[in-house]
């Protein structure tokens, strides 16, 4: 999906009203220096590209996030905001559910999470120039 | 305007089964999810799960899984809650809820439909 | 499983007096992810604070709501005979998502 078109002030909006709030809850607990962050995005469309791929595609270690509260309100945005989102999306939830585990929060989900924390606020900031 | 409007009343005996409904208008159904809310006779509200209807994505709360099934069909704008097989303790109103983003970006359920009665008698 | 506890389950209040409902939630949440919603006998419930303390639209100014953590409030200043009704609390951080038990605001 291409997410040039979205309306990215809204999705920053919502993020900062209420998904951060939950990416918070979900790393409670963990010292915000215990990852450091190795995934990045150049501008909001690569940013939200990524973040996508993040929350919604299963990886080895975790294969749970996309039930989790922040990733349920993240497709909301995304479908909302993006022309067009929840179309393209069917295909992936397909295969998500079949390579979906028992809801467990592991050390690779929290790392996840944490690059996640640290791409959504790339995405707040899109006039940053990349380190 | 969005709206969400259910289906009628049921009357039911235990063991058959049912499927009401929740047609909506006035906004981009397959975006947003819907909820389904239940309320016994002279009780409060208990969420019952909700559909995704772009990509049929549902999550369940563990007291009702297993008991009912909901579903959508992106075609006539319509989200679904089924029982396979009634129980005189399924006799409540039952409202679906679409949830949304208001205007100061908090996620809630926003518009509600007018609930649908069911009544499971022997 | 978050619980929401509401109290007093049942309120008589006078015309004109102040109201002050009360939920309870078993473990922290974010201020963003508390909202309240009326319910009128035989009507559907009608969303009426988001997020702990921002009024939905086309709510009077007499409604307030606070807290944070685990304890929020809803506030009526100066209750009009329109305000009787149910009002439930509900929780958006986590599933499954619950509502308290309503607290019954009534004419005394």
């Known amino acids: 999906y291409d997410f040039t078109n979205c309306d990215f002030e809204k999705i920053k909006a919502a993020y900062l009203s209420t998904i951060s709030k939950d990416l918070i809850t979900y790393m409670s607990g963990t010292k915000s220096t215990e990852f450091n962050n190795t995934v990045s995005c150049s501008n909001r469309p690569h940013c939200l590209t990524e973040i996508q791929s993040l929350t919604f595609n299963p990886t080895a270690g975790c294969a749970s996030l996309a039930k989790e509260m922040f990733a349920m309100k993240t497709k909301a945005a995304l479908a909302i905001w993006c022309p067009g989102y929840s179309e393209t999306q069917i295909n992936a939830t397909q295969a998500m559910k079949k390579a979906r585990k028992s809801k467990v929060t592991t050390n690779k989900c929290l790392e996840q999470v944490s690059q996640l924390q640290g791409l959504w606020r790339r995405f707040n900031r899109p006039l940053l120039k990349q380190q | 305007e969005v709206q969400l409007v259910q289906s009628g009343a049921e009357v039911k005996k235990p063991g058959e089964s049912l499927k009401i409904s929740c047609k909506s208008s006035?906004?981009?159904?397959?975006?947003?999810?819907i909820n389904w809310v239940r309320q016994m006779p002279g009780k409060g509200l208990e969420w019952m799960g909700q559909?995704?209807?772009?990509?049929?994505?549902?999550t369940y709360n563990g007291n009702f899984k297993g008991q009912v099934t909901i579903s959508a069909d992106k075609s006539i704008s319509t989200a679904y809650l089924q029982w396979s097989s009634l129980k005189a303790s399924d006799t409540a109103m039952y409202y679906c809820?679409?949830?949304?983003?208001?205007?100061?970006?908090?996620?809630?359920?926003?518009?509600w439909g007018q609930g649908t009665t069911v009544t499971v008698s022997s | 499983e978050i619980v929401m506890t509401q109290s007093p389950a049942t309120l008589s209040v006078s015309p004109g007096e102040r109201a002050t409902l009360s939920c309870s939630v078993s473990?922290?949440?974010?201020?963003?992810?508390l909202h309240w919603y009326q319910q009128k006998p035989g009507q559907s419930p009608r969303p009426w604070i988001f997020?702990?303390?921002n009024l939905a639209s086309g709510i009077p100014a007499r409604f307030s709501g606070s807290g944070s953590g685990t304890e929020f409030t809803l506030t009526i200043s100066s209750l009009q005979s329109e305000d009787f009704a149910v009002y439930y609390c509900?929780?958006?951080?986590?599933?499954?998502?619950?509502f308290g038990g309503g607290t019954k605001v009534e004419i005394k």
């Open positions: 559909i995704f209807p772009g990509d049929g994505d549902t």
């Open positions: 006035g906004y981009a159904f397959s975006s947003y999810w």
């Open positions: 997020g702990t303390s």
């Open positions: 473990s922290s949440i974010s201020s963003s992810n």
């Open positions: 809820a679409r949830s949304g983003f208001d205007y100061g970006y908090f996620y809630a359920m926003d518009y």
């Open positions: 509900q929780q958006w951080s986590s599933y499954p998502l619950t």
